[in-house]
């Protein structure tokens, strides 16, 4: 819309029809140009010319929010909109006030005003922006986490939607979307949005709000899915009768009025448009739902969103098709149903879809329901390669176990490349903290072997000046290092193989590790503060550093390394999409740094680095340093936590998965 003044005065135009529609999560450019006959104006020979002042604002009934102001080549952005709005062509083209808006959210809908002031002249133009689309969570009818990547897309397509992009999920999150269920996205990553972190929903962000990610996953792994419904031209409406309808009757009822049962996606779009019905109705996928736009206690527990009626208290299963509800119909020719056989399925392979509502509703569950599942934990979707019940872990650690894990189960049997009989108990379990929030993060307790006059050390009183002792294992497997390889491994991590004295001092400072490792003198030892069955070693139930004595150099164990002070600084690096291993290397290099080594991270930890985010290190491991323990950050002890691929604490993360990074310079 243009507001021109008389001919030779300042005029501003937005050459774009209003409303301008754009998709959630995308960026948008609003062109704005001005013609300024006065330019440049000089007030007196001695003063500089006045330059026009550009102001962009968003106008609503309640208020006007200034997005940015530009004058004399300088652009000042409202801090709330920093990194969100910009003038891409200014000041290169002084009369071009085109506005760019990144990562569109639903909340960005509204009327945008481009205003130019020059001296006492003032002109403006406005444009309405409508951000289209809604992201919603989908789940197969039977149970949670059953959709591979293909089926996930099919689920969305059958519900008038497409699989959402990471940008769309991020935008929905910023609009308030919260869901503790891991779901596929279009880029083959698996993520979930969390505003109020809680046990079972921490993922890779611990107690910080944000969209959790597992990175790129294998297409055969199974999760839920996040779908994106763009828009609809038709109308969703309720059909009802005093005795209500069975599913089949509901479908027939819609047909008799020239419509069909609405899809879940269409209902979400209707809800987004303000639909509010306190009565549940059948949808095309045989689910039963109702849209609540005005919260009230007796309608969906005082929560907004599309509410779902489930068969079971753990939010799975649809009502019996013979039960009676209203019919939710859709009239419109803008959607064409894709035939079932276009997904190559039939009969028993058929899936229909259901969602958990937005915002998240946690039902009180009967005691026999898996508690972790109620909270949104991931049930590992492993083919049962172990004769045991599946391990429950939180969404952030969900992994479909690969057959390569072998048949050894979590407490390892101390497998070795060279079989040697030991007269003592061999450390057989992966070190696990009692309350590890992360299923596959190791609870390595690492103790600073440092002391300064009057300093209180936690825990205990170490006797060595400077440095840190830490346990090291290559990502692939436990007990794989010969004596030679062990020394090299420590050097590669920016450390040196520890001496028995250093390990002893660490033990006295409270260090415990139930993993046998090489030391400088070719002995193999491990420090145990609280003896337990697989860790008694040569000391039975007494605490102490267990030893196997001098071992043949060809035998394979882990290693204990020692790192002295840090020559440089370790810093935490991140970006919104995070990094693959290669991207992390490149990012550090761009900062005149390298990915930090494990040793450097331990040294930085000993100097107080505390980060509740796992980050890539130079050896392809994922670790994070915790100085102040808190429940959400790797348990109740300080130390450097390691994220492993498998629950038995072996395996490196996929180099293509996305994480933060620790750089060193």
């Amino acid at each position: 819309e243009e507001v021109p003044d008389h001919d030779n005065s300042l005029s501003v135009s937005i050459p774009q029809p209003s409303p301008l529609k754009a998709l959630l999560g995308t960026s948008l450019t609003i062109p704005c140009y001005f013609i300024d006959p006065m330019h440049p104006v000089t007030t007196a020979p001695s003063t500089a010319p006045l330059t026009p002042r550009i102001k962009w604002s968003r106008v609503s009934k309640e208020k006007e929010v200034v997005l940015l102001v530009a004058t004399e080549g300088q652009v000042r952005v409202n801090s709330i909109y920093q990194d969100k709005v910009s003038l891409p062509n200014y000041p290169a083209i002084p009369s071009d006030a085109t506005l760019e808006i990144q990562n569109l959210r639903s909340n960005d809908s509204g009327i945008y005003r481009c205003e130019v002031m020059h001296g006492i002249e003032d002109s403006e133009a406005t444009l309405e922006v409508i951000v289209k689309g809604i992201v919603f969570h989908y789940r197969a009818i039977s149970t949670r986490y059953t959709l591979d990547f293909d089926r996930a897309q099919r689920a969305c397509l059958q519900n008038s939607a497409i699989i959402a992009t990471p940008e769309q999920l991020q935008a929905a999150y910023e609009d308030g979307f919260h869901q503790c269920d891991a779901g596929w996205l279009a880029d083959q990553t698996v993520r979930y949005p969390i505003h109020t972190p809680r046990e079972g929903c921490y993922g890779d962000k611990d107690e910080f709000p944000g969209v959790r990610t597992y990175g790129i996953r294998d297409t055969n792994e199974t999760y839920d899915v996040y779908c994106f419904a763009e828009e609809m031209e038709g109308e969703v409406f309720y059909a009802t009768s005093p005795e209500k309808f069975t599913f089949q009757e509901a479908a027939n009822e819609c047909r008799t009025v020239g419509a069909r049962l609405a899809t879940t996606g269409q209902l979400y779009l209707a809800w987004q448009g303000g639909m509010d019905m306190c009565s549940a109705g059948w949808l095309a996928d045989r689910s039963v739902r109702y849209p609540i736009s005005k919260a009230r206690p007796n309608c969906g527990g005082n929560l907004l969103g599309v509410r779902t009626v489930y068969l079971h208290a753990n939010q799975t299963g649809y009502p019996d098709p013979s039960s009676r509800y209203d019919a939710i119909c859709y009239t419109g020719e803008d959607f064409v149903d894709i035939p079932e056989n276009f997904f190559g399925v039939g009969g028993e392979e058929d899936i229909t879809i259901q969602t958990v509502t937005w915002p998240d509703l946690e039902l009180p569950l009967p005691r026999n329901i898996t508690e972790g599942e109620a909270r949104g934990n991931v049930i590992l979707t492993a083919k049962p390669i172990f004769d045991m019940s599946p391990t429950v872990s939180e969404p952030g650690e969900a992994l479909t176990l690969a057959p390569e894990v072998g048949t050894t189960v979590f407490p390892e049997a101390g497998e070795r490349t060279e079989k040697t009989t030991r007269p003592w108990g061999f450390p057989e379990e992966a070190t696990r903290g009692p309350d590890s929030a992360t299923a596959f993060a190791s609870e390595d307790l690492v103790v600073r072997v440092t002391i300064s006059p009057g300093a209180v050390e936690v825990p205990g009183q170490p006797r060595l000046p400077g440095g840190v002792v830490f346990h090291y294992r290559p990502g692939s497997t436990r007990y794989s290092l010969t004596f030679e390889e062990a020394q090299q491994a420590c050097i590669r991590t920016g450390a040196a193989i520890a001496s028995p004295e250093q390990l002893q001092a660490a033990y006295e400072a409270g260090y415990e590790q139930c993993d046998a490792g090489w030391l400088q003198d070719q002995t193999v030892r491990y420090p145990i503060v609280s003896p337990r069955t697989p860790c008694v070693g040569d000391k039975d139930s007494s605490p102490g550093v267990r030893t196997y004595g001098v071992r043949p150099s060809s035998e394979t164990y882990d290693v204990y390394c020692y790192v002295d002070k840090l020559e440089g600084e370790v810093f935490f690096a991140t970006q919104m999409e995070q990094f693959t291993f290669q991207e992390a290397q490149a990012f550090c290099a761009a900062q005149n740094a390298t990915l930090a080594s494990t040793g450097q991270l331990y040294a930085a930890w000993s100097q107080g680095l505390d980060k509740c985010y796992a980050g890539w290190l130079a050896d392809g491991t994922l670790r994070y340093p915790i100085v102040n323990p808190r429940p959400a950050c790797g348990g109740d002890k300080p130390g450097v936590r390691t994220v492993y691929l498998y629950p038995n604490q072996t395996g490196l993360p996929d180099p293509l998965s996305k994480h933060h990074a620790f750089c060193f310079r």
């Epitope: 990547f149 897309q153 497409i162 279009a186 880029d187 763009e230 064409v336 894709i338």
Partner: nanobody, 115 residues
Amino acid sequence: EVQLVESGGGLVQPGGSLRLSCSASGFTFSGSWMFWVRQAPGKDYEWVASINSSGGRTYYDDSVKGRFTISRDSAKNTLYLEMNNLKPEDTALYFCARSPRVGSWGQGTQVTVSS
């Protein structure tokens, strides 16, 4: 902005062949199921073929099985439909689609099979 642009249509004799292309932009093509849909004059839309995101699975309407082949080149963000042994009943406007929403499809390319 999401765009799907079809090309390759034309007039062909019965028994002849055509290869339709659809150039995609503005979305993650490599992560999307893709479809060919057609609409004959005065008729409803008819789904012709589908292909999954990796290209490993393809499905066809019974009327075109054995004659049509759907494929994709994710490096070029392009979807194809190879049509052999064309019949007069294949005459239609052919659309490339990534969802059931008609408004998100391309403009279509006309295929006419006539002697």
